[in-house]
């Protein structure tokens, strides 16, 4: 998978100061690369826009949990 290895890393330099409504969020990914200045979570919204968030904040953790449960629940 050379493409994945060489893919540019998106880093977060600032975090949102806002608590985002979980209903607006579609997915997330964790940023843990040593190339980035800080660990972060990038949420993708339902309209495919990305937002940097602080993984230490409770609302961010709760939102990740919510999205995890959504993906684990089979859609009927």
């Amino acid at each position: 998978q050379p493409d994945a290895i060489n893919a540019p890393v998106t880093c977060c330099y600032n975090f949102t100061n806002r608590k985002i409504s979980v209903q607006r969020l579609a997915s997330y990914r964790r940023i843990t690369s040593s190339k980035c200045p800080k660990e972060a979570v990038i949420f993708k919204t339902i309209v495919a826009k990305e937002i940097c968030a602080d993984p230490k904040q409770k609302w961010v953790q709760d939102s990740m949990d919510h999205l995890d449960k959504q993906t684990q629940t089979p859609k009927t």
Epitope: N14, N17, I20, S21, K49, E50, I51, C52
Partner: antibody
């Protein structure tokens, strides 16, 4: 249809008051921050104020602090701007706008009302 | 407050021209920069956010680039409907601020 419909502009004397309204439809209003942006005749854009989803957090540009109050009623899908102690320099078209979060900052605008003209003159 | 200086303040161009508009911030705004198009008597329309992300539904002839103090909006091939005023806006910190605009006129 996703839209913002504005009302409440008009002519007011210096020192007077006016309340602007913005009715949202086609999206879940309570999930978004909202802003007011103004534009003096023939001039550029100036952000005025914004408000958090549940109304608990508000920010204002210095020139309107203590005179303008932003508020919202999520049950009515409506945003408001109460303008008191109006001055000639507040004359502008006022736009309401949906306020989004970016990758590295908060507060850009992806949906706008058509604007309403406020004229402050004696 | 962060000041945004747009240049030029106006320009004349022809249909098909490549047009480059610039926006300089008085201090760093990371990639927290948006571009809008406004036509007379109308509300602004979002074109670009996060300095280089194209808003849904906006033609691909529009592109944004830059970081730090200097940003550009490029229109690769100017179309008749692109004659308008363009504003940049920073959302790195309060107060949110706009540039003074660049008016793109028909040559």
């Amino acid at each position: 249809e996703v839209q913002l419909v504005q009302s409440g502009g008009g002519l007011v004397q210096p020192g007077g008051s006016l309340r602007l309204s913005c009715a949202a439809s086609g999206f879940t209003f309570s999930h978004y921050w909202m802003s007011w942006v103004r534009q003096a005749p023939g001039k550029g854009l100036e952000w005025v104020a914004n408000i958090e989803q549940d109304g608990s957090e508000k920010y204002y540009v210095d020139s309107v602090k203590g005179r303008f109050t932003i508020s919202r009623d999520n049950a009515k899908n409506s945003l408001y701007l109460q303008m008191n102690s109006l001055r000639a320099e507040d004359t502008a078209v006022y736009f309401c706008a949906r306020d989004l979060e970016g990758l590295h900052g908060d507060g850009y605008f992806d949906l706008w009302g058509r604007g309403t003209l406020v004229t402050v003159s004696s | 407050a962060i000041q945004l200086t747009q240049s030029p303040s106006s320009l004349s161009a022809s249909v098909g021209d490549r047009v480059i508009l610039t926006c300089r911030a008085s201090q760093g705004v990371s990639s927290a920069l948006a571009w809008y198009q406004q036509k007379p008597g109308k509300a602004p329309k979002l074109l670009i956010y996060d300095a280089s992300s194209l808003e849904s539904g906006v033609p691909s002839r529009f592109s944004g680039s830059g970081s730090g103090p200097d940003f550009t909006l490029t229109i690769s091939s100017l179309q008749p409907e692109d004659f308008a005023t363009y504003f940049c806006q920073q959302f790195n910190s309060y107060p949110l601020t706009f540039g003074g605009g660049t008016k793109v006129e028909i040559k």
